[in-house]
């Protein structure tokens, strides 16, 4: 006990009343107003509790403190007076803070700040939405993946920031009257081939596909080494050049030089160069046959092989090249007598006649084109007088039936053997290479050297043998009529042709032989 009458055992947060009693300090309370035993305690009064008489007023919050309390403005509000705390409603000067004005970038990009009492909200621009994890951040709505399918099936959806577009797919274009971009866009396939929007090389033909196109090698062309066919970047080369090379086993410098020229012409060949290339090949052939050089020293059989190879290859090359010519009639002649006549037309329904110095050919146009071939129709005739040098002493092989009949009615071939070539060798070709069985025959009128009396004149063609060489044959060809210096032949196939004079000892005009030939 304190001698002055104040209890020394008062609990924390209390003061003594007298020597035997204590009272809790303001802001604290105990079970009874007067504390008489040291076991009692003073507890903080929560002035902010609901039943409290304290009222801070609107836009404010009550904050309890040890033994007291403070009124403060709620978040988003601030006191006009500037005082951070106050004790009652009468001192309250809280008013709303305009956060949007205070910090214009509060809503970051793509959002508009909207002030609210005590706070603000972010309103996203069209095409944006609030990010769930950060409700103040607007992010782009991907309309293309949101399952809304906002675009027509002929278009593809392109998401962009805050928006989207419905764009025509590559190789498609808006249908007439349709925009290209808005959600009402409707597209259709572009025909790049007919519209000229393709990038096909001139060695290829353009084929339209849905939404795209491809480039295929022209007929008679093949993809360049290592480049696939039917691609946008396909580049092709003319097969005729790559396959026309010297025959195996023949060693001739003159012939090698000829084929070097052919390969040179093929190396940088383009369809537009067809006319010049044809002329250059025939010029080279004309020179080769005018001056055969070491070809003349080859054994006869090898010479026949070379001739066979030249005739066969020339026909293929001319057929391939002439498909790239424009419509019309072409005639070329060369110093040693080589002559080319060519007619190129879109399919026409009439007969065609090609006239040359020593030969005339007549046939039906509709033979020229293979059905389904989109190219032009070509009919060609080449006279190659120089080929006679290489075909000297070439054998004539008759069909067994003709051979038998001749043996029965004649003494057969005289001892001096091989038939004599009376005419120029001519080669006929069409754009259609299937000419083994023509639906209507072709007629040739040959001008030639005089026929020796009592000799038989035969219309023949060169048959390329299995061994790559060949021989004269008469199958499918008949002699319609012959005069001293001209003969008319009719054949049911195309190849290389000539008129031969066979050394038969013909006593008089034989009706059987006439029928046979």
């Amino acid at each position: 006990q304190d001698s002055r009458g104040c209890a020394r055992w008062c609990p924390q947060d209390s003061s003594c009343v007298n020597a035997t009693a204590c009272r809790c300090n303001p802001g604290f309370s105990s079970f009874s107003e007067i504390i008489t035993t040291p076991m009692e305690t003073c507890d903080d009064i929560n002035e902010c509790a609901t039943l409290s008489k304290v009222s801070c007023g609107k836009f404010s919050d009550c904050w309890n403190t040890e033994g007291s309390y403070d009124c403060v403005c709620s978040p988003g509000y601030e006191p006009v007076s500037g005082a951070k705390t106050f004790k009652n409603e009468s001192e309250n000067t809280c008013q709303d803070v305009d956060e949007c004005q205070q910090n214009p970038r509060l809503c970051k990009s793509y959002g508009t700040c909207v002030n609210t009492l005590g706070s603000y909200t972010c309103q996203c621009l069209p095409g944006f939405k609030l990010k769930p994890e950060d409700p103040k951040l607007c992010t782009d709505v991907n309309e293309c993946t949101s399952g809304q399918n906002p675009c027509h099936s002929s278009t593809h959806c392109l998401n962009n920031v805050g928006s989207y577009q419905c764009r025509c797919r590559p190789g498609w274009q808006p249908i007439p009257g349709s925009p290209n971009g808005p959600n009402n866009t409707v597209c259709e396939d572009v025909d790049e081939c007919s519209s000229g929007q393709h990038q096909c090389d001139s060695s290829t033909v353009c084929f339209n596909t849905v939404g795209s196109y491809s480039c295929r090698c022209r007929p008679g062309w093949k993809p360049r080494h290592g480049i696939p066919n039917n691609q946008k970047d396909t580049v092709c080369e003319d097969m005729t050049f790559s396959t026309w090379t010297p025959p195996p086993g023949v060693h001739s410098q003159t012939l090698s030089r000829f084929f070097d020229k052919v390969q040179d012409l093929g190396r940088d060949y383009k369809p537009g160069l067809a006319n010049n290339t044809i002329q250059s090949i025939l010029q080279a052939l004309d020179e080769l046959l005018e001056a055969p050089g070491d070809l003349e020293t080859l054994p006869r059989l090898q010479q026949h092989c070379v001739a066979s190879h030249l005739l066969d290859g020339l026909e293929d090359v001319l057929r391939g090249l002439s498909k790239n010519l424009s419509n019309g009639l072409l005639n070329f002649s060369y110093p040693a007598g080589t002559e080319l006549s060519l007619e190129v037309q879109k399919q026409v329904d009439r007969s065609v006649t090609l006239r040359q110095n020593q030969a005339v050919m007549q046939l039906d146009w509709n033979q020229a084109q293979k059905s389904g071939d989109p190219g032009p129709s070509v009919v060609g005739l080449v006279s190659i007088p120089g080929m006679g040098k290489l075909l000297a002493e070439a054998p004539l092989v008759l069909e067994p039936e003709k051979q038998m009949l001749l043996h029965e009615t004649h003494q057969g071939l005289l001892q001096d053997g091989s038939p004599i070539l009376l005419s120029d060798v001519i080669s006929a070709f069409l754009s259609n290479n299937d000419t083994q069985n023509l639906s209507s025959p072709v007629t040739f009128t040959f001008s030639h050297r005089s026929v020796i009396p009592r000799q038989k004149v035969l219309c023949v063609f060169w048959e390329h043998g299995q061994n790559g060489c060949g021989h004269w044959a008469t199958t499918g060809c008949s002699t319609i009529g012959t005069r001293d210096t001209s003969t008319i032949c009719r054949c049911t196939h195309l190849s290389s042709f000539a008129v031969l004079m066979a050394h038969y000892d013909v006593q008089e005009e034989d009706p059987v032989l006439t029928v046979i030939t």
Epitope: S202, S203, K270, G272, N275, S280, A284
Partner: antibody, heavy 118, light 106 residues
Framework: QVQLVQSGAEVAKPGASVKLSCKAS????????MQWIKQAPGQGLEWIGA????????RHTQKFKGKATLTADKSTSTAYMEVSSLRSEDTAVYYC???????????WGQGTTVTVSS | EIVLTQSPATMSASPGERVTMSCSAS?????MHWYQQKSGQSPKRWIY???KLASGVPARFSGSGSGTDYTFTISSMEPEDFATYYC?????????FGGGTKLEIK
């Protein structure tokens, strides 16, 4: 008759580019390659390359790859050569010529003089 | 690339004289062409495909050869023939020219 008319003389600074033209007339533009040839002062003829006007295909000598760009415009029958990153060694007369393997270069333009000087 | 070597590089001749120049190729060539160029002028095609005279070229000019060796001949020099002559091939890419033979008046 066949004619190849080239653009006028050019003076350019080092590093710049020039685009020369060659207008063809009197023949079918797509029936021949268009050749470009350089002749430096007092020197011989040097092939740069060729363009085929029918499809824009080009051939170049290695030395001029990336240096000379060859193009052709079928609609105007004009061939072009752009020479880039010019240096003093590019000072020369540049010719265009119509060419075909078997015939050589049968018609030539009058030439365009390019002078590279700082 | 095929290198074309022309010889001689320069030669002198008098009018009426026969002149021969050669062009040697590092590999076989099948199409050889020759051009004439006078000072300040564009080249002119003179002989093509080894031996064919270009339009307007006088018959005193001739060409021959095959493989790697080619010859250009003027049977009887005329004053207007003094010029530089170039050979050229396109048998393989790149196309190449010879260095030229300059024909001067003696």
């Amino acid at each position: 008759q066949v004619q190849l008319v080239q653009s006028g003389a050019e003076v350019a600074k080092p590093g710049a580019s020039v685009k020369l033209s060659c207008k063809a007339s009197g023949y079918t533009f797509t029936n021949y390659w268009m050749q470009w040839i350089k002749q430096a002062p007092g020197q011989g003829l040097e092939w740069i390359g060729a363009v085929y006007p029918g499809d824009g295909d080009t051939r170049h000598t290695q030395k001029f790859k990336g240096k000379a760009t060859l193009t052709a415009d079928k609609s105007t029958s004009t061939a072009y050569m752009e020479v880039s990153s010019l240096r003093s060694e590019d000072t020369a007369v540049y010719y265009c010529a119509r060419g075909f393997t078997a015939y050589g270069m049968d018609y030539w333009g009058q030439g365009t003089t390019v002078t590279v000087s700082s | 690339e095929i290198v074309l070597t022309q010889s001689p590089a320069t030669m002198s001749a008098s009018p009426g004289e026969r002149v021969t120049m050669s062009c040697s190729a590092s590999s076989s060539v099948s199409y050889m062409h020759w051009y004439q160029q006078k000072s300040g002028q564009s080249p002119k095609r003179w002989i093509y495909d080894t031996s064919k005279l270009a339009s307007g070229v006088p018959a005193r000019f001739s060409g021959s050869g095959s493989g790697t060796d080619y010859t250009f001949t003027i049977s009887s020099m005329e004053p207007e023939d003094f010029a530089t002559y170039y050979c050229q091939q396109w048998s393989s890419n790149p196309l190449t020219f010879g260095g030229g033979t300059k024909l001067e008046i003696k």
